[in-house]
């Protein structure tokens, strides 16, 4: 058993049939010595008498909120959550596996650029009764800063007969230096409580490898004379890093017919322009990526050819 | 077993106010999300508002129907394991029996207490 904060404690049990559990021995706080008794979620039922209650917590229903009393004046509450761990290995009940990029991935995060702000998201089948907390670090043995905000759902999707939740928060590096090589990576750290179920989620991560550009802006088509080709230009995003001449992106260009078959031209370019034949009835589209080190590609900008 | 007993409804004039409360037992209250659901005559349940609590970081959510946005606060207070609905600027649209529920469809709920907005 351990406290997760002031009041709300965390019961490690294994759990398989008929596991023994786990004896827990719950303190009054108070300075009273005699006539204290407990009740477990107000239920009217006395469990026990005395400054301490020990209990053999086993299921679910052993857990939820202590409170000793004393002559109908409430002394102190204690809420016991439990943490499964089935063949030695911590539940993850609570979020759904992402599968990408590989097996076992609960947590994503993208930055959209090196200032040391990240997002991270996780998804959720379960609607009600569940909370989160985020927090996070460079580096785990000597941690330095990152500031998270508040989980948020943003976003719900219908996946088949099942609805799925996604939640989401941002986190700041306190002290970023957008420059700098990494060394130590980002440890991202998610609690999540359902009913009184607790679950723990983690991930570990440099910034260079969660980069993301916005996708280039003002993307725009010139007609050149006498030619059926188009010069393209775009716009580094406005929230990439800057200095453009350090901070540097390469972008893919791609000519996309109506129909999904028709063959894709493409054109790579370290420049904001190039010109390619633009076909009737086909898109442009532009994506951006980090010219000197291979993460994520931007999704794409597109202009119809027309 | 699960006990929301709702009390604070009453025969109230327009424009007037009361506050509803729910005392829960049977079930660890800080860790569930609480709903109020009303009732009109003749009508279906309607969903009024949501408190969350999360237990991790001490803060509380509130969430309200367009109907009631402005006018009506839900709160909780945890250590005496009771949910309020405090309502302002009552009309007579919000005539209608409430309960005080566990989930949002008010499959869980108490008895009710009845508010009638009449003058």
């Known amino acids: 058993i351990w406290e997760l904060k002031k009041d709300v404690y965390v019961v490690e049990l294994d759990w398989y049939p008929d596991a023994p559990g786990e004896m827990v021995v719950l303190t009054c706080d108070t300075p009273e010595e005699d006539g204290i008794t407990w009740t477990l979620d107000q239920s009217s039922e006395v469990l026990g008498s005395g400054k301490t209650l020990t209990i053999q917590v086993k299921e679910f229903g052993d857990a939820g909120q202590y409170t000793c009393h004393k002559g109908g004046e409430v002394l102190s509450h204690s809420l016991l959550l439990l943490h499964k761990k089935e063949d030695g290995i911590w539940s993850t009940d609570i979020l759904k596996d992402q599968k990408e990029p590989k097996n076992k991935t609960f947590l994503r995060c993208e930055a959209k650029n090196y200032s040391g702000r990240f997002t991270c998201w996780w998804l959720t089948t379960i609607s009600t009764d569940l909370t989160f907390s985020v927090k996070s670090s460079r580096g785990s043995s000597d941690p330095q800063g990152v500031t998270c905000g508040a989980a948020t759902l943003s976003a719900e999707r219908v996946r088949g007969d099942n609805k799925e939740y996604e939640y989401s928060v941002e986190c700041q590096e306190d002290s970023a230096c957008p420059a700098a090589e990494e060394s130590l990576p980002i440890e991202v750290m998610v609690d999540a409580v359902h009913k009184l179920k607790y679950e723990n989620y983690t991930s570990s991560f440099f910034i260079r490898d969660i980069i993301k550009p916005d996708p280039p802006k003002n993307l725009q088509l010139k007609p050149l004379k006498n030619s059926r080709q188009v010069e393209v230009s775009w716009e580094y995003p406005d929230t990439w890093s800057t200095p453009h001449s350090y901070f540097s992106l390469t972008f893919c260009v791609q000519v996309q017919g109506k129909s999904k078959r028709e063959k894709k031209d493409r054109v790579f370019t370290d420049k904001t322009s190039a010109t390619v034949i633009c076909r009737k009835n086909a898109s442009i589209s532009v994506r951006a990526q980090d010219r000197y080190y291979s993460s994520s590609w931007s999704e794409w900008a597109s202009v119809p050819c027309s | 077993e699960v006990q929301l007993v709702e009390s604070g409804g009453g025969l109230v004039q327009p424009g007037g106010s009361l506050r509803l409360s729910c005392a829960a037992s049977?079930?660890?209250?800080?860790t569930h999300w609480m709903y109020w659901v009303r009732q009109a005559p003749g009508k279906g349940l309607e969903w009024?508002?949501?408190?969350?609590?999360?237990?991790?970081?001490?803060?509380?959510?509130?969430y309200y129907s367009d109907s009631v946005k402005g006018r009506f606060t839900i709160s909780r207070d945890n250590a005496k394991n009771t949910l309020y609905l405090q309502m302002n600027g009552l009309k007579p649209e919000d005539t209608a029996l409430y309960y005080c529920?566990?989930?949002?469809?008010?499959?869980?709920k108490g008895q009710g207490t009845q508010v009638t907005v009449s003058s």
């Open positions: 529920a566990r989930d949002s469809s008010g499959n869980l």
């Open positions: 009024v508002a949501t408190s969350t609590f999360n237990i991790l970081t001490g803060t509380e959510n509130t």
């Open positions: 049977g079930f660890t209250f800080s």
